[in-house]
Amino acid sequence: SETTTGTSSNSSQSTSNSGLAPNPTNATTKAAG
């Protein structure tokens, strides 16, 4: 569910304090059965 360009080094932002993971994983989606 995302489009990503570039890298995700996240060299400056303190992601812990921002509440966001440094490089969030793609949410897994289950195929409709």
Partner: antibody
Framework: EVRLEESGGGFVQPGGSMKLSCVAS????????MNWVRQSLERGLAWVAQ??????????RYVESVKGRFTISRDDSKSTVYLQMNNLRPEDTGIYYC??????WGQGTTLTVSS | DVVMTQTPLTLSLTIGQPASISCKSS???????????LNWLLQRPGQSPKRLIY???NMDSGVPDRFTGSGSGTDFTLKISRVEAEDLGIYYC?????????FGGGTKLEIK
Amino acid sequence: EVRLEESGGGFVQPGGSMKLSCVASGLTFPNHWMNWVRQSLERGLAWVAQIQLKSDNYATRYVESVKGRFTISRDDSKSTVYLQMNNLRPEDTGIYYCTTGTDYWGQGTTLTVSS
Amino acid sequence: DVVMTQTPLTLSLTIGQPASISCKSSQSLLYSDGKTYLNWLLQRPGQSPKRLIYLVSNMDSGVPDRFTGSGSGTDFTLKISRVEAEDLGIYYCVQGTHFPYTFGGGTKLEIK
């Protein structure tokens, strides 16, 4: 004190375009990921887009429903993040908040897409 | 997408009563760095959301210590030891582990 101030909302017809802006103060802007979040009565709070840092080559992420229609960008020299919205749909209606993550939020700007 | 399910939908309490809000995620929010990116927000009437808690249990500055966050994996709880008038509004959980980041539907706290 951190302040995020959005502007640019208004009324637009389906298929139209709008550009939102958010000016930040009280923080080292180039060091923060910036995000747009939409709030609507029908869908509640929903993340829309994210732009990362210069050191990340300004990586961007978009929620599926706005891919190809919305573009997030930033101007670190102006401490400003933008959201260019094209081919707008009624379901894009809502209050758009600029956020640094989950920690700091602007007051929001309202977009109404209707014929 | 990760579905965040909050219960109850509404809490109607008198001043001084305790409150408990549950948030369950459809996938584990434990990230590879060992941290769990689960946040709690409060949106007071007519205002934008304000964060209360991040990383499950870390309180933001200025947040009264009557608020506590707990949980792990997929089950999380926000507790208010004694509700005060200023606590009214809608509480949201939001996860920052998986993209797209997703929010719970909200729990409205009303003061009787």
